[in-house]
Structure formats: C-alpha cells, structure tokens
C-alpha cells in the first residue's frame, strides 16, 4: 500500500514538475527590466529563451523572436538545450512511469518489470529536474554577471552632456517557476526510486522448512522455482509478501509461502 502511494505521489509530483518545466521554457519572463533605482520608464522590457518583449504603458505589447541561431550567446543556447533535454527526459519518464504504476494492470506484467520501469522513470525524472535546475541557474548567473557589469557603467556620458541609461535586467518569473518545477521533478524522481525498492523482487526472509512426505523427503528451500515445481517455464522469483494486509490483487496475483507443491 505504502509502495503504491509513494509511486503514485512520485508520479503526480513529477507530472506537476514537468508541466512547470515546460511552462518555464515557454515563458517570456526569464529576465525583466530592473525598475529599482532606475528612472521610471513608460516602457517595460522582458526577455525569454525564444523572444524578447516590450510592454508600453499604453498597453501595447510587442514581442520579437530571436530569428538567429549563430548570433545568440552560447550561454543562452546552452540553457535552451538543458531545458529541452529536461523536457524530453521528463516526457519519456512520464510515459514509462504510467506503465510502471502498480495501480495499472497491463497484461501479465511482472513486478520485476514494473520495478525496473519505476527505477528508470525515477532516474529520468531526477536527471530532468537537474537539467531544469542547471538551465535556470546558468541563466540566473548570466543575469547577475550582466547586472553588475551594466551597473558599473550604468551611466555612459555622451559628450559630457547627455546621458544614456542602460537597461538592466533582473530575475523574471520564469526562473522561479523553473527552480520550483525542477525541484518537484527531482523530488518526484527520488520518490519513484524509493517506490522501486518496494516493488523489486527480494529473497524471502523465512528459514528453510522440511516437510516429510510418505516415501520420500522434499526440502523446500528459498530460491528460484525450478521447472519441476509445476510453474512451467517461469523460472523467475516472485515477490512474496509475508505479513501485513493484502489487497485482493495481491492475494490473486502472487503465490504465498504456503503455495507449495
């Protein structure tokens, strides 16, 4: 029960996280014009990964895409790449985790397969979250560097008479969305990995028991079921739940320790 809850919660948290990463990547407000200690302008500038926008106090907003690849800063390209990798990994992780959910029955998929899929999706979510956090952090670092550089020469004299105020940019809403979303995806991934441990097949805990039958002796020892035990070609260990309340599915799906031949 706890395993199912952990897995389900991990899935939901990751889903929210990845939705947030997608939202952050698409948002225009990665950097916004710094209004503190600046003359009040009737124009507000903000920039995203894909376009820059200008909002006038009149209400008119104009956005222009970055229609160049080679002309863009390498750091911006790196951030784009990290966010896209994060989204792709997260999307694949979501797809994998849907089939790995314990509450979803797909044919005769075994627990070991579900455990592997849960672990795979968990790792994907972790890497996806890390990509998003890294991307946002690289962009934030770039902003901080540029902010202090433009502060150092904020007022550049023109002929000693006229002054040009340089537009400084500070953290936009997308950065905070990205950090939170990356964190959620990371947490979701960790939860999936924890859930995987609960799903993974384990060695049984009880000691070997001897049963004396008439005429010959059969020792039932923990380990793989052999073909001769009557389970056909299924040579894989099945998880044996000993103790605790079982769901109807568990009772039906898994041989108990008393299912001896």
């Amino acid at each position: 029960m706890a395993v199912t809850a952990c897995q389900g919660l991990g899935f939901v948290v990751s889903l929210i996280g990845i939705a947030g990463i997608i939202a952050a990547t698409c948002m225009d407000q990665w950097s916004t014009q710094d209004l503190y200690n600046n003359p009040v302008t009737a124009v507000f500038n903000y920039q995203g990964l894909w376009r820059s926008c200008v909002r006038e106090s009149s209400g008119f907003t104009e956005c222009r895409g970055y229609f160049t690849l080679l002309g863009l800063p390498a750091m911006l390209q790196a951030v784009r790449a990290l966010m896209i990798v994060g989204i792709v990994l997260g999307a694949i992780g979501l797809l994998v985790s849907i089939f790995a959910l314990k509450c979803i029955r797909i044919g005769s998929m075994e627990d070991s397969a579900k455990a592997n899929m849960t672990l795979t999706s968990g790792i994907m979510f972790i890497v996806s979250g890390l990509c998003a956090i890294a991307g946002v952090s690289v962009f934030a670092n770039m902003l901080v560097t540029n902010f202090w550089m433009s502060t150092a020469n904020m007022y550049t004299g023109m002929g000693g008479m006229v002054q040009t105020v340089q537009t400084r940019y500070t953290f936009g809403a997308a950065l905070f969305v990205g950090w939170v979303a990356g964190g959620l995806t990371l947490i979701g991934g960790v939860m999936m990995c924890i859930a995987c441990r609960g799903l993974a097949p384990e060695e049984t805990n009880y000691k070997a028991v001897s049963y004396h039958a008439s005429g010959h002796s059969v020792a039932y020892k923990p380990g793989g079921f052999k073909a001769s035990t009557g389970f056909g070609s299924n040579t894989k260990n099945k998880k044996i739940y000993d103790g605790g309340a079982r769901t109807e599915d568990e009772v039906q799906s898994y041989p108990s320790k008393h299912d001896y031949v």
Epitope: P39, C53, G59, E62
Partner: antibody, heavy 118, light 113 residues
Framework: EVMLVESGGGLVKPGGSLKLSCAAS????????MSWVRQTPEKRLEGVAT????????YYPDSVKGRFTISRDTAKNSLYLQMSSLRSEDTAVYYC???????????WGQGTSVTVSS | DIVMTQSPSSLTVTAGEKVTMSCKSS????????????LTWYQQKPGQPPKLLIY???TRESGVPDRFTGSGSGTDFTLTISSVQAEDLAVYYC?????????FGAGTKLELK
Amino acid sequence: EVMLVESGGGLVKPGGSLKLSCAASGFSFSNSAMSWVRQTPEKRLEGVATISSGDSYTYYPDSVKGRFTISRDTAKNSLYLQMSSLRSEDTAVYYCTRQGYGNAMDYWGQGTSVTVSS
Amino acid sequence: DIVMTQSPSSLTVTAGEKVTMSCKSSQSLLNSGNQKNYLTWYQQKPGQPPKLLIYWSSTRESGVPDRFTGSGSGTDFTLTISSVQAEDLAVYYCQNDYYYPLTFGAGTKLELK
C-alpha cells in the same frame, strides 16, 4: 469614432479644489492608458497625470504630486482628475488624452479651461 | 525630468519650401528592447488641440501626409516637411514618451512669409 469630452473646468480661488471629468467613447477604455495634459497661457504643454492600462500605475510630475489624483470609472467610461491646493500656475487648458502606440497621445479632447485666481 | 529642447522657436517659410526642425532630449529615448526611439511629434493649429503626427520617432500616424518625415535616434531628432503647404502652418511639439513624466518641447512655430 473615438470621442473624448472634458468637463468640470472653471474659475477657482488659490488653495481651492476642482474635479475634471472626461467622458470617453469609441474604444476599449479599460484597456487604454489615459493622460491629462495641460496647456498654459504661454502655450507650453505639460503632462500632469497618467494612468496606465489596467490601472496598474499612476504617474505625476513633481509639480502636481500630492495635489492631483487621476482615476477612472470603467463602468461609466469616465476619466477624472481631482485637483486640490490649486495655485495660480495651475491655470491652463486641460486636455484628456488616450495613449496609443509608442505611448503617443493619439486622441485628444477639446479641452476644459481652469483658471486659478483670487 | 527629461528636458526637450526644440529649435528654432519659429520658422518663416514660403509654400513649397522644404522645412526642417530639431528636437534634442537630455537623455537617450532609444529603448534597447525593441530598438525604437520613444519620441513623438504633434501639430497644433490655433484653437485646436494638438494632433499626433509621428510616433516612434519615424512612424507616421494614419492619415498624416507623407510630406511629413521623422528621423533621428537617441537624443537628436528631426521633423522634415518636404514641401510646406498653407495648412501646415502651426506649432510643432516634440515629446519624450520614454521617461515619466512625459515631457514636451517648447514648440516650433511655422509661419508664412
């Protein structure tokens, strides 16, 4: 057709108050930035108050800050300028304007005259 | 506040003549975000409110004759009337539309010889 009609001007004593109104029609009033601009007897133009689209911000020059208040009633499509502690230098024709592209004042009313004199 | 300086204060011209008037701002009106200059030109005829001619320093308002041309960037701007007509006799104002408070120049009065 865009129409801006000012009213409420008149003669007032120094230190007195006056409220100007501007009835707007023919455009999306609530989504537009609006301004009051005055023209002095010497024909100088001065922006005295601006309210941004969505009413997010109001702006005033230092000469009127604390004395003038711009507001709007979107239900009535009306813009207001509450003027208090009036001085003789506030004597002017007050225009109600709408801001368009480039924050430029693309539509102006005919103006209402305010005279501050004892 | 941004100071807008217009020159000359008045111009006496003959019909058909090319006219140029200048406007200088104390700070750059160029917005780095969209590379547009927030400088506006108005025309005011006697007894009328000002009328918008040009915004973004060079974009003509719809209905404005193409003999009116705005140019310039940063702090120096120019309004040119390629061939003055009798109906162009008015006062021309430039305005800073970038920094609050939005300030106007003192105007250039266009008169007939």
